[in-house]
């Protein structure tokens, strides 16, 4: 390849010089000159920079506010931000996880397809024929109707998506 049309990767242009960027975890103190090197300093406690940069200030680590239902999932370093997640029974309202909401419950007639996590809500699905859910729950799946036949019983009342079948004894034939 011919000579570059820009500074090299991990360099930036300042005062006609291609200077070294500061590595992740460090901030810029002074630009290089034709006679001196770029001067960088490590980020302080509770600060970070996650890219090769020319920032003069490090970013503050995210605060996981317990009043918003948040807790620390992964502590930040000088090169990474803190990762927040939600307390048990709650999930993040956005990808950035700035606040939490209570997990949704699946109403009667619906079962849990996917249990909620710290970052995703409960996914409900309607109970198909042969299955029911008679409770509002964030954990319960649709249950299969009871099989009366296996108990030597007969269906006395048909099941719905919200109720189980009702089994009863078989009618005896009289002589």
């Amino acid at each position: 390849p011919e000579p570059p049309t820009a500074c090299r990767e991990k360099q930036y242009l300042i005062n006609s010089q291609c200077c070294s960027l500061c590595q992740p975890g460090q901030k810029l103190v002074s630009d290089c000159t034709e006679f001196t090197e770029t001067e960088c300093l490590p980020c302080g406690e509770s600060e970070f920079l996650d890219t090769w940069n020319r920032e003069t200030h490090c970013h503050q680590h995210k605060y996981c506010d317990p009043n918003l239902g948040l807790r620390v999932q992964q502590k930040g370093t000088s090169e990474t931000d803190t990762i927040c997640t939600c307390e048990e029974g709650w999930h993040c309202t956005s990808e950035a996880c700035e606040s939490c909401v209570l997990h949704r419950s699946c109403s009667p007639g619906f079962g849990v397809k996917q249990i909620a996590t710290g970052v995703s809500d409960t996914i409900c699905e309607p109970c198909p024929v042969g299955f029911f859910s008679n409770v509002s729950s964030a954990f319960e799946k649709c249950h299969p109707w009871t099989s009366c036949e296996t108990k030597d019983l007969v269906v006395q009342q048909a099941g719905t998506n919200k109720t189980d079948v009702v089994c009863g004894p078989q009618d005896r034939l009289r002589a």
Epitope: P3, P4, T5, R8, E9, K10, Q11, L13, Q17, C18
Partner: antibody, heavy 125, light 106 residues
Framework: EVQLVQSGAEVKKPGSSVKVSCKAS????????MHWVRQAPGQGLEWIGN????????HYAQKFQGRVTITVDKSTSTAYMELSSLRSEDTAVYYC??????????????????WGQGTTVTVSS | DIQLTQSPSFLSASVGDRVTITCSAS?????MHWYQQKPGKSPKRWIY???KLASGVPSRFSGSGSGTEYTLTISSLQPEDFATYYC?????????FGGGTKVEIK
Amino acid sequence: EVQLVQSGAEVKKPGSSVKVSCKASGYTFTSYWMHWVRQAPGQGLEWIGNIDPSNGETHYAQKFQGRVTITVDKSTSTAYMELSSLRSEDTAVYYCARERIYYSGSTYDGYFDVWGQGTTVTVSS
Amino acid sequence: DIQLTQSPSFLSASVGDRVTITCSASSSLSYMHWYQQKPGKSPKRWIYDTSKLASGVPSRFSGSGSGTEYTLTISSLQPEDFATYYCQQWSSNPWTFGGGTKVEIK
């Protein structure tokens, strides 16, 4: 202080290989390309090739293509130049040199701002 | 490849002399760079971007030129200036050097 410290002198037999090291200090090693230049006794300077320490990308002078390998070890901020199938004409002082790029109004250009102390390689039977 | 031809290749001069070294390129260049080398030592960046002096280089040195003709001039030669000077280009790959000009004491 920016420094490039090279390995010691080597005496090699024709047909063998030599690997010269260049340890960098005083700057961010992966931010600047490293070059290798040689100088035969009483002769001028000859460019061999270069490497981007951040990703290992290399470029070699056509004359040395297939015979030279330039590598880096980022963990120790060290560049290496290996020359194989040595012949007597390869007897020279080998230098590592740091590339410096600047912009002068219309185009970018480059020169060598820091040089190693040189490594003498003698090829003799 | 761009060829750089330095002239003269050998120069004998006295302290106080004005000395001019020429570097001719086989194709037009954007800039020229110069290095000083003393016996048994590594080359040192001396002049870059055609006319800018590297750190610690005395002001008696100057550089000029454009296109295919570039010069390094020493206005009044001093004992510490006796060395070999090399020109270098990177307007086009590969990087190339001139053959050198050795400045010796007359």
